[in-house]
Amino acid sequence: AVSEHQLLHDKGKSIQDLRRRFFLHHLIAEIHTA
């Protein structure tokens, strides 16, 4: 699982790339994206 902490501290990523990774994780884990 990709934690929010990992994603937000992953330097050099665009905001869309973070959203992209969150959404891909959401499709697998069905975690609410709000």
Partner: antibody
């Protein structure tokens, strides 16, 4: 290896309905989001629908919202696309695709052709 | 809105290199995109995802002749040592989530011809 096999295509009159199926094998179907992408004859690709691993979340573009419904039966390893109120512009090859943790459409089937014509 | 622009066609000789371009709408210049290959009469195949910094991850079975790079709003797919089987349509695509809605768009595709 990942295998996705679409079926259910054919010729249908405008305004009628059709249900496509995608039989999945070679992976744990219930662990991944799935999508449908279509391609009109001689044209480019268009995303049609996406569903989460357990089926709780679905997503559609405006072009099919309210007419198409994506669903899945994880006990049968099968993805579905229910298409209602079909139009001539829905004529296309319909592909199912599987996500990975890294990308949306990592694996694709060979497609099934839907022709909407009177 | 989110738009991807591709040249309709490209050609290069067998064994040579070719660089295909996908241009994001200016306000989306930082976005990560995906590249897909579609050989004649076949389903599409995932090639790679490509980030704004040029880093990329390739799909299963994609040879290392395929590489990606980025400059501003442009995303490039470079194929070196061209083989006849590289003749195909190449599409870029990009997805985003806005207000809990998902959107995914494809470019119009580039038809690559490998000259004998």
């Amino acid at each position: 290896q990942v295998q996705l096999v679409e079926s259910g295509g054919g010729v249908v009159q405008p305004g009628r309905s059709l249900r496509l199926s995608c039989a999945a094998s070679g992976f744990t179907f219930s662990s991944y989001g799935m999508s449908w992408v279509r391609q009109a004859p001689g044209k480019g690709l268009e995303w049609v629908a996406t569903i989460s691993s357990g089926g709780s979340y679905t997503y559609y573009p405006d072009s099919v919202k309210g007419r198409f419904t994506i669903s899945r039966d994880n006990s049968k390893n099968t993805l579905y696309l229910q298409m209602n109120s079909l139009r001539a512009e829905d004529t296309a090859v319909y592909y199912c695709a599987r996500q990975t943790t890294m990308t949306y459409f990592a694996y694709w089937g060979q497609g099934t052709l839907v022709t909407v014509s009177s | 809105q989110l738009v991807l622009t591709q040249s309709p066609s490209a050609s290069a000789s067998l064994g040579a290199s070719v660089k295909l371009t996908c241009t994001l709408s200016s306000q989306h210049s930082t976005y990560t995109i995906e590249w897909y290959q579609q050989q004649p009469e076949k389903g599409p195949k995932y090639v790679m995802d490509l980030k704004q910094d040029g880093s990329h991850s390739t799909g299963d079975g994609i040879p290392d002749r395929f590489s990606g790079s980025s400059s501003g709003a442009e995303r490039y797919l470079t194929i070196s040592s061209l083989q006849s089987e590289d003749e195909a349509d190449y599409y870029c695509g990009v997805g985003d989530t806005i207000k809990e809605q998902f959107v995914y768009v494809f470019g119009g595709g580039t038809k690559l011809t490998v000259l004998g």
